[in-house]
């Protein structure tokens, strides 16, 4: 069994977690991918997933979570905007590959969100505000219900994450609503 490792990120309320999960292999490019939370004693819970097949550079938004799959670089970008203290927890990216178990992308992310916003130098709180004001088209999320608590074979290289300031005031309430976010060049 592969040893589970974690990367810890300590952020303030209102900030954005920006994680890049590295899946490396072309065979995974079109596979459906998901962002899950792992709570003690529970099965991993899928919070958001890409489409099936996963579309290239096509943002999918579920509440305050935005997934964007970059096939050409083997990266799944996960953003959780306007973080709340209750978002603290252990997260992971997985690749669905039915009928096999989901393929977990290492490392897991240990997110710790604390009270009190602390702005970063040169940051703009409204930098992407307009993106989320565009009238959304919504559809039902088609995330597989099955999740496995077990880990899967080999681990691709680590994910990386960085920090930015708040992007919006979207609340993570109805996780079945997906918003297509236009891409601006």
């Amino acid at each position: 069994a592969t040893k589970l490792t974690e990367e810890k990120y300590e952020l303030k309320e209102g900030q954005t977690l920006d994680v890049k999960c590295d899946y490396t292999l072309e065979k995974f490019a079109s596979s459906q991918k998901a962002w899950q939370i792992i709570r003690d004693g529970e099965m991993p819970k899928t919070l958001a997933c890409t489409e099936r097949p996963s579309k290239n550079s096509h943002p999918v938004q579920v509440g305050r979570i935005i997934l964007e799959d970059y096939h050409d670089h083997g990266l799944l970008r996960v953003r959780m905007v306007n973080l709340q203290v209750e978002d603290s927890g252990l997260y992971q990216c997985v690749i669905y590959q039915p009928p096999k178990e989901p393929h977990m992308l290492f490392d897991r992310i240990r997110l710790v969100v604390t009270k009190g916003f602390s702005g970063t130098p040169g940051s703009n709180e409204n930098s992407t505000q307009n993106v989320y004001k565009i009238p959304p088209t919504t559809t039902k999320a088609l995330c597989p219900l099955y999740t496995s608590p077990r880990t899967v074979t080999q681990a691709p290289p680590k994910s990386t994450a960085d920090v930015s300031t708040p992007d919006s005031e979207i609340n993570l309430t109805n996780v079945t609503d997906i918003i297509r976010v236009p891409v601006f060049n």
């Epitope: 590295d22 072309e26 670089h73 990266l75």
Partner: antibody, heavy 121, light 111 residues
Framework: EVQLVESGGGLVQPGGSLKLSCAAS????????MHWVRQASGKGLEWVGR??????????YYAASVKGRFTISRDDSKNTAYLQMNSLKTEDTAVYYC????????????WGQGTLVTVSS | DIVLTQSPDSLAVSLGERATINCRAS??????????LHWYQQKPGQPPKLLIY???NLESGVPDRFSGSGSGTDFTLTISSLQAEDVAVYYC?????????FGQGTKLEIK
């Protein structure tokens, strides 16, 4: 252990053709893109091109200097990549290396020993 | 095409001293916070050997006197304490965009 072995090099006249092979072992060949890199004597490295996997419809990409003259192909059942070189020029004289990356747009972790192609009349 | 320019073209450093090689890209080789810039070492008669991948990650089995840094367009390969076996030509290479490209190489010698 990953091994890449190039073959097919030799002396060819300008305007002629040559087909290089790269026999791979020690890994799941069909999973990775394969690349060709060349090096003229005493000169630097030049990326020639790459072929992606079946998942990416075996898409190929080439350096401008060889586009339209060179063709990269692969046979996953034989664990072999190929470089078909047509309309050869004297400036194509070089050692040709076969390389394997570590995944999508990743680094070249594995290299063959190279095969020498000499284009001369 | 992304042009990679290495400096200097050649470098002579005393044993035990620090060697620094720079690589400048004509445009960014970053995608998000990943720099798709790698460093290779090549000795005469041998194929290149990977030293550093994605700007700063040390390849398995490579001595830790080698390190890489940088992002965007400016990158550096550093050998903290030059050893005799480090005499070679060093190349940077980008894979962020097709066509992939190499720097022209830097020849490292002992002073």
């Amino acid at each position: 252990e990953v091994q890449l072995v190039e073959s097919g090099g030799g002396l060819v006249q300008p305007g002629g053709s040559l087909k290089l092979s790269c026999a791979a072992s020690g890994f799941t060949f069909s999973t990775y893109a394969m690349h060709w890199v060349r090096q003229a004597s005493g000169k630097g490295l030049e990326w020639v091109g790459r072929i992606r996997t079946k998942s990416s419809s075996y898409a190929t990409y080439y350096a401008a200097s060889v586009k339209g003259r060179f063709t990269i192909s692969r046979d996953d059942s034989k664990n072999t990549a190929y470089l078909q070189m047509n309309s050869l020029k004297t400036e194509d004289t070089a050692v040709y290396y076969c390389t394997r990356d570590m995944g999508i747009r990743r680094q070249f972790a594995y290299w063959g020993q190279g095969t020498l192609v000499t284009v001369s009349s | 095409d992304i042009v990679l320019t290495q400096s200097p073209d050649s470098l002579a450093v005393s044993l035990g001293e620090r060697a620094t090689i720079n690589c400048r890209a004509s445009e960014s080789v970053d995608t998000f916070d990943y720099s798709f810039l790698h460093w290779y070492q090549q000795k005469p008669g041998q194929p290149p050997k990977l030293l550093i991948y994605r700007a700063s990650n040390l390849e398995s089995g490579v001595p830790d006197r080698f390190s890489g840094s940088g992002s965007g367009t400016d990158f550096t390969l550093t050998i903290s304490s030059l050893q005799a076996e480090d005499v070679a030509v060093y190349y940077c290479q980008q894979s962020n965009e097709d066509p992939y490209t190499f720097g022209q190489g830097t020849k490292l010698e002992i002073k």
